[in-house]
């Protein structure tokens, strides 16, 4: 048994059917020494008296909120909460496997830039009862600081019978210089609380391994005199690291027509314009990536060829 | 993905096509090592991440972009002295900082070369005959080299007398060529930010 | 005690369904995960299928996937697999399991396809 | 196909010590746990270790389990005619979790 955090404990079960479970002996936060009585959440059974209680904890029903009192006032209360171990590995019942980029992903991450600024989001089927907390850090033995804000809803979408919902936050760290060469990942930790089960989700990176630039901006078509040829321009991201000398960026100009199975024309550039042949009702696109570093590609920017 | 490949103009700053050519070379050595010893640890997210440098150069300090100088975060001044004499230097644009990067990231190659060509001298010994370095990417080196032209004492290569462990060699191999890339893309930045200048 | 009583085993045509039904007892089915594994006669184990406790997530061994369905009534504590176009190579005793560090097994149950 | 390995068969006399290996990857019995059951001939598979080496109440302290890097193995000291049965390691894929991944199984003969 562990504390979460002030009056909230977890307690570990090796979770099989018929096991021991944990003893837990709780203790009233009171001078009091007698004609203390013990509750648990809203019954009015008691289950013991004392200053402390002894309980044998094995399954949902045994954990909750037990609370002290005499002569009906509340001492003290402590919330008993159960992290599931099953066959060697804690339970993953809160989060959805995003399965991207490969099985058992609970968290992905994101940045725009190198400033050291990334988000992380996750997915549950949940929609009550659920609480997240986030911490971060560059690297685990000797931590380096990174500040998490608080996790939030940021969309709800409908999956076949089920809901789905999306939960972000955002992180920065503390003192990040763009240019520097990671050699610690920066760690994520997520602890999930649906009612009365607890879980925890990491995810360890890199910044440069979780680079997604923004679409480029202000793209812009030029025809080209008696051609069917135009020139496509375009700039850099806003949210992208300066100087661009130095964080460059490639690109990607692609033609697609207004059927998806239309061969599409694809270029590739460094620079910030190109020649392409725009066909009547296709559209180009154009989308970004650290040029020396292949992380993920940025969304597509878009504009019609008429 | 393979990275474009850039044509120098006659006036470009003479090492940016080297150092692409490095940044491909190491890239695609790191991805074929992580192909033969798929049964090794050799991910990103399996090594432990070495920086053979590190407190023997000071390549992203004395290469810092101007506009990064005045994020405190990036100012780890270690003060590290070099000679600076290099042909990569545009004479009428040299200045003592620039030198001092260039003649940093010479230092960085020629440590990196010593350790390559140890390891390769090793892997050649292994009766599995496993993995090899690539000749290309040995050769990118020393062409960056060259066209750094920085004058500094030859380091002897390493020799070792015990029996080498063929298995340690290789996991070794996977911690340099992930660290030798991230420098790679370091260099690259630093050549296509001085050819901009 | 833990109880996990296997039925609905047989001999079937190839290409045809059969269903088979784990009725668990001693313990609080709905809150523990449940596998499906089989031997076929004189081969080595082979895990089929995995529900989590609310039927939430399933998964499925690649040789089964599309054909057979694992299922669970918490109502009945009762685990199902439904198996659909049964092959010749789908002969096997199939076992239901709980998930767990300490697990409980089923009596087994032979499913034999042929025609 | 099994990523787990076994060797087919082992034997030894009443007394002897008889060890079976179980030899997968980094990503099965590299990162997770290791089970071992022992089956006797028409019946289902009886639990031996859990956790790589810890015994459920009831198994005899003659079966041993351990695990070293991508490799586990279970040991039986002086071995005894009832222990001739079929064993099968057991552990997961940290990619495929929670599908089981058994051994190819090692036949065990008591001689004598």
């Known amino acids: 048994i562990w504390e979460l955090k002030k009056d909230v404990y977890v307690v570990e079960l090796d979770w099989y059917p018929d096991a021991p479970g944990e003893m837990v002996v709780l203790t009233c936060d009171t001078p009091e020494e007698d004609g203390i009585t013990w509750t648990l959440d809203q019954s009015s059974e008691v289950l013991g008296s004392g200053k402390t209680l002894t309980i044998q904890v094995k399954e949902f029903g045994d954990a909750g909120q037990y609370t002290c009192h005499k002569g009906g006032e509340v001492l003290s209360h402590s919330l008993l909460l159960l992290h599931k171990k099953e066959d060697g590995i804690w339970s993953t019942d809160i989060l959805k496997d995003q399965k991207e980029p490969k099985n058992k992903t609970f968290l992905r991450c994101e940045a725009k830039n190198y400033s050291g600024r990334f988000t992380c989001w996750w997915l549950t089927t949940i929609s009550t009862d659920l609480t997240f907390s986030v911490k971060s850090s560059r690297g685990s033995s000797d931590p380096q600081g990174v500040t998490c804000g608080a996790a939030t809803l940021s969309a709800e979408r409908v999956r076949g019978d089920n809901k789905e919902y999306e939960y972000s936050v955002e992180c920065q760290e503390d003192s990040a210089c763009p240019a520097a060469e990671e050699s610690l990942p920066i760690e994520v930790m997520v602890d999930a609380v649906h009612k009365l089960k607890y879980e925890n989700y990491t995810s360890s990176f890199f910044i440069r391994d979780i680079i997604k630039p923004d679409p480029p901006k202000n793209l812009q078509l030029k025809p080209l005199k008696n051609s069917r040829q135009v020139e496509v321009s375009w700039e850099y991201p806003d949210t992208w690291s300066t100087p661009h000398s130095y964080f460059s960026l490639t690109f990607c100009v692609q033609v697609q027509g207004k059927s998806k199975r239309e061969k599409k024309d694809r270029v590739f550039t460094d620079k910030t314009s190109a020649t392409v042949i725009c066909r009547k009702n296709a559209s180009i696109s154009v989308r970004a990536q650290d040029r020396y570093y292949s992380s993920s590609w940025s969304e597509w920017a878009s504009v019609p060829c008429s | 993905r393979n990275l474009p490949v850039a044509t120098p103009d006659p006036g470009m700053f003479p090492c940016l096509h080297h150092s692409q050519n490095l940044l491909r070379a190491v890239s695609n050595m790191l991805q074929k090592a992580r192909q033969t010893l798929e049964f090794y640890p050799c991910t990103s997210e399996e090594i432990d991440h070495e920086d053979i440098t590190k407190d023997k150069t000071s390549t992203v300090e004395a290469c810092l972009p101007l506009e990064l100088t005045k994020n405190e975060s990036c100012l780890n001044s270690r003060e590290t002295s070099f000679i600076t004499n290099g042909s990569c230097l545009a004479s009428r644009k040299t200045s003592f900082m620039m030198a001092l990067c260039l003649s940093s990231i010479y230092e960085d190659l020629k440590m990196y070369q010593v350790e390559f060509k140890t390891m390769n001298a090793k892997l050649l010994m292994d009766p599995k005959r496993q993995i090899f370095l690539d000749q290309n990417m040995l050769a990118v080196i020393d062409e960056l080299m060259q066209a750094l032209n920085f004058n500094s004492e030859t380091v002897p290569q390493k020799s070792s007398l015990e029996e080498p462990d063929f298995y340690k060699t290789k996991i070794k191999l996977c911690i340099l060529l992930h660290a030798f890339r991230i420098r790679a893309v370091t260099i690259d930045r630093v050549m296509s930010y001085l050819n901009a200048s | 005690q833990v109880q996990l009583v296997q039925s609905g085993g047989g001999v079937v045509q190839p290409g045809r369904s059969l269903r088979l039904s784990c009725a668990a007892s001693?313990?609080?089915?709905?809150?523990?995960?449940m596998h499906w594994v089989r031997q076929a006669p004189g081969k080595g184990l082979e895990w089929v299928a995995f529900?989590?406790?609310?039927?939430?997530?399933?998964y499925y061994a690649d040789s089964v996937k599309g054909r057979f369905t694992i299922s669970r009534d918490n109502s009945k504590n009762t685990l199902y697999l439904q198996m659909k176009s049964l092959r010749a190579e789908d002969t096997a005793v199939y076992y239901c399991?709980?998930?767990?560090?300490?697990?409980?097994w089923g009596q087994g149950t032979m499913v034999t396809v042929s025609s | 196909s099994y990523v787990l390995t076994q060797p087919p068969s082992v034997s030894g006399t009443p007394g002897q010590r008889v060890t079976i290996s179980c030899s997968g990857g980094?990503?099965?019995?590299?990162?997770?746990?290791v089970k071992w059951y022992q089956q006797l001939p028409g019946t289902a598979p009886k639990l031996l270790i859990y956790g790589n080496d810890q015994r459920p109440s009831g198994v005899p302290d003659r079966f041993s389990g351990s695990k070293s890097g991508t490799s586990a193995s279970l040991a039986i000291t002086g071995v005894q005619a009832e222990d001739e049965a079929d064993y099968y390691c057991?552990?997961?894929?940290?990619?495929?979790?929670?599908?089981?991944?058994f051994g190819t199984g090692t036949k065990v003969t008591v001689l004598g």
């Open positions: 399991k709980t998930h767990g560090s300490h697990d409980n």
């Open positions: 529900i989590r406790y609310d039927g939430s997530n399933k």
């Open positions: 001693g313990f609080t089915f709905s809150s523990y995960g």
């Open positions: 980094r990503s099965n019995i590299g990162s997770n746990i």
């Open positions: 057991q552990s997961y894929d940290r990619g495929t979790h929670p599908a089981l991944l």
